[in-house]
């Protein structure tokens, strides 16, 4: 169900504070704009108020998309989706946000990485990712290369490799050359998920060839 309201909310934290405390899809408004976007809000995990910016769970959505698609978002907020780089960039440049990445493997294990500071640069700077203050159970070293890299897609090669990481590993991501993670890689089902260089990778938790079962990237204001 879509949960719409006359109020304007910039993120799921504002939705939560307005009294909407159930998980679901809500309409958010771009900062300093009337443009709207649909996002899934997790109102239960870790106190709620989380804006889901990425979800992988079943391979139902193709993540080998263009720069424009990653800019505006794609997929279904109730399932697999990418919220959109432009919205996330605008949002995270308004105030300080934390980023939590929740991961599941095929053996029933779960882990997370929490970054206490997160923002994306503007499109002019290729939505470069900035992260600080890593804690969590998915590795003491960041699987997103630091300092952050520019975002790359199959039609927008901004990585640090003479190869084209997005074409080789599939999906849009903040590739280095090509780096220790890609949560937007190919979805591989159980028993086909090992020794896959182009899968859903978080190196400092499961190594380079392991493709994960499920991932969620979520953001919330640091002062929530």
């Amino acid at each position: 169900d879509y949960k719409d309201d006359d109020d304007k909310f910039r993120d799921c934290a504002e939705v939560f504070k307005s009294g909407h405390t159930t998980n679901g899809i809500y309409t958010l408004t771009f900062p300093n704009s009337t443009e709207e976007i649909k996002a899934y809000c997790d109102m239960e995990a870790g106190g709620g108020g989380w804006t889901i910016i990425q979800r992988r769970e079943d391979g139902s959505v193709d993540f080998q998309r263009t720069w424009k698609e990653y800019k505006v978002g794609f997929g279904n907020p109730s399932g697999e989706y990418w919220l959109g780089n432009e919205f996330v960039s605008q949002l995270t440049n308004q105030q300080r946000y934390v980023l939590k990445i929740h991961l599941k493997d095929w053996e029933g294990n779960e882990a997370y990485s929490l970054y206490e500071h997160f923002y994306l640069s503007s499109e002019e700077l290729n939505y470069r990712i900035h992260l600080k203050g890593l804690t969590g159970t998915a590795g003491k070293i960041s699987s997103i290369s630091q300092p952050g890299n520019d975002f790359s897609t199959k039609d927008g090669d901004n990585d640090k490799c003479i190869c084209k990481c997005s074409q080789m590993l599939t999906g849009g991501w903040w590739f280095a050359a090509c780096g220790p993670s890609n949560l937007n890689g190919m979805y591989y089902p159980q028993r086909q998920n090992t020794n896959k260089f182009n899968g859903i990778k978080w190196y400092y938790w499961k190594g380079s060839g392991y493709s994960l079962k499920a991932t969620t990237m979520m953001i919330r204001p640091a002062d929530f």
Partner: antibody, heavy 121, light 107 residues
Amino acid sequence: DVQLQESGPGLVKPSQSLSLTCTVTGYSITSDYAWNWIRQFPGNKLEWMGYISYSGSTSYNPSLKSRISITRDTSKNQFFLQLNSVTPEDTATYYCARSTFGHYVSSMDYWGQGTSVTVSS
Amino acid sequence: SIVMTQTPKLLLVSAGDRVTITCKASQSASNDVAWYQQKPGQSPKLLIYYASNRYTGVPDRFTGSGYGTDFTFAISTVQAEDLAIYFCQQDYSSPPTFGGGTKLEIK
């Protein structure tokens, strides 16, 4: 290539204000990152003073908060340090530097060559 | 503020030696620790960021490690041009703070 250059008076009288300019070339200070002032006292101790981010927000060292102001002139791609009510203990080499994160403190990858300031009557 | 206690203050070494400098944070700094080199008459230069990442163009004889409160910086084979003061810096919490420095002198 990114370059930073400090400028300002080398001698300031006690109780007066210290004003320094950092001119940045090769990168727009409104594009990204935070733009810092750091000082190094005789004896080599380093102290972070504060920054102005690409968005214009500022953060200061609490030990200086009542005396410090960092501003910028985006048309000239410059940012400034003003330190009020100086004493001889403010004698130091002052550096401007770019940090690798735009909304918070972080490591600093580009530094100016530094300018020496003496506070004395 | 997080206090960064850096040891030793002075290192007297010969070319070819391996040297190690340590920094201890008064509380956890996660992996948000950098190491700088300052040669005589110059400004500090970033060598290592996020505890273990070598900055662009930095020779691989310089390495960093650590997490939480204990951090180590090493030069595997000291060269004459490594004469400098080395500083650690935490930027996990504001204000960022520096260690007192280690002066590396060549015998």
